[in-house]
């Protein structure tokens, strides 16, 4: 997956830091105070979407081959820049009973982006 560098507008991963204070969650999340969540941004032109390296799955690659040739019903489908790899992160927080919990929360960090 590409890292966004400001030079290209192709699907890439953009760095983004989430502060739990900003979204009002600092009263129940003990640690961390924030983290690099990141997000996906950019274009998915057919020549990129059809390549397995940037594609979300084998399925996406196959469908994009049909799309590139204008086959119905895929001709008008738009490929989107989405997370292809996510990572968990450990958090310390208060649960519904105000007990302190340490838990690995799944899919918190975008590691890589690709075309759907």
């Amino acid at each position: 997956g590409l890292e966004c560098d400001g030079k290209v507008n192709i699907c890439c991963k953009k760095q983004f830091f989430v502060s739990f204070k900003d979204i009002g969650w600092n009263d129940w999340i003990i640690a961390p105070s924030g983290y690099h969540a990141n997000y996906c941004e950019g274009e998915c032109p057919s020549h990129i979407a059809g390549t397995s390296g940037s594609s979300l799955s084998f399925h996406s690659t196959v469908i994009n081959h049909y799309r590139m040739r204008g086959h119905s019903p895929f001709a008008n489908l738009k490929s989107c820049c989405v997370p292809t790899k996510l990572r968990p992160m450990s958090m310390l927080y208060y649960d519904d009973g105000q007990n302190i919990i340490k838990k690995d929360i799944q899919n918190m960090i975008v590691e890589e982006c690709g075309c759907s």
């Epitope: 009002g24 969650w25 519904d96 799944q106």
Partner: antibody, heavy 123, light 108 residues
């Protein structure tokens, strides 16, 4: 301490509207969802919908869609539930309850409730 | 929507006895996102159990919850006079949130 204080009892005629308030204190209002639950006389609990105080996003029970509106005023930490076109079967005690609807962290139980507001619909 | 069925509808027991309340879901409740509430006449419900088995703040240890998937149980090991009330299960796995019909625990 956490408190949800609701407005007083109401008597309404069929076809009218009612707006019930729920004033929160003792916690960060925008960190939580406010859910509304009603209970007809001698009956069980019925979930009506929820609003996220941070964003105003709502989720309503299908049977009430189009008749119910939930809003919040973050400046006063108050949630409101308006029910329109009232019928006699809307006679119930209406409760607000708070929850953190964050499934990934296992959160979502209704840990604090308001005292309830009796709404009577009668001609 | 997930339909929750509670049984029995009424449980007639004496103080000191053990109460076992059942809650069955029409489909699997993801990650055991199931809560139990106690309601006494003229009062708002009170959270007893969340996450199927964790006791809420200030709830005595005679209350315990168990189960996963579609079958859940609330157990009161030794009934105290103040435990006679109506008990509801609720799922918070999916929208719409749904409640069971309730089980009334009454004095025999």
């Amino acid at each position: 301490q956490v408190q949800l204080v609701q407005s007083g009892a109401e008597v309404k005629k069929p076809g009218a509207s009612v707006k019930v308030s729920c004033k929160a204190s003792g916690y960060t209002f925008t960190s939580y969802y406010i859910h509304w639950v009603r209970q007809a006389p001698g009956q069980g609990l019925e979930w009506m919908g929820a609003i996220y105080a941070y964003s105003g996003d709502t989720n309503y029970a299908q049977k009430l869609q189009g008749r119910v509106t939930m809003t919040t005023d973050t400046s006063t930490s108050t949630a409101y539930m308006e029910l329109r076109s009232l019928r006699s079967d809307d006679t119930a005690v209406y409760y607000c309850a708070r929850a953190r609807d964050i499934a990934a962290a296992g959160l979502g139980a209704f840990d604090y409730w308001g005292q309830g507001t009796l709404v009577t619909v009668s001609s | 929507e997930i339909v929750l069925t509670q049984s029995p509808g009424t449980l007639s027991l004496s103080p000191g006895e053990r109460a076992t309340l059942s809650c069955r879901a029409s489909q699997s409740v993801r990650s055991s996102y199931l809560a139990w509430y106690q309601q006494k006449p003229g009062q708002a419900p009170r959270l007893l159990i969340y996450g199927a088995s964790s006791r809420a703040t200030g709830i005595p240890d005679r209350f315990s919850g168990s189960g996963s998937g579609t079958d859940f149980t609330l157990t009161i090991s030794r009934l105290e006079p103040e435990d006679f009330a109506v008990y509801y299960c609720q799922q918070y796995s999916n929208y719409p949130r749904t409640f069971g019909g309730g089980t009334k625990v009454e004095i025999k």
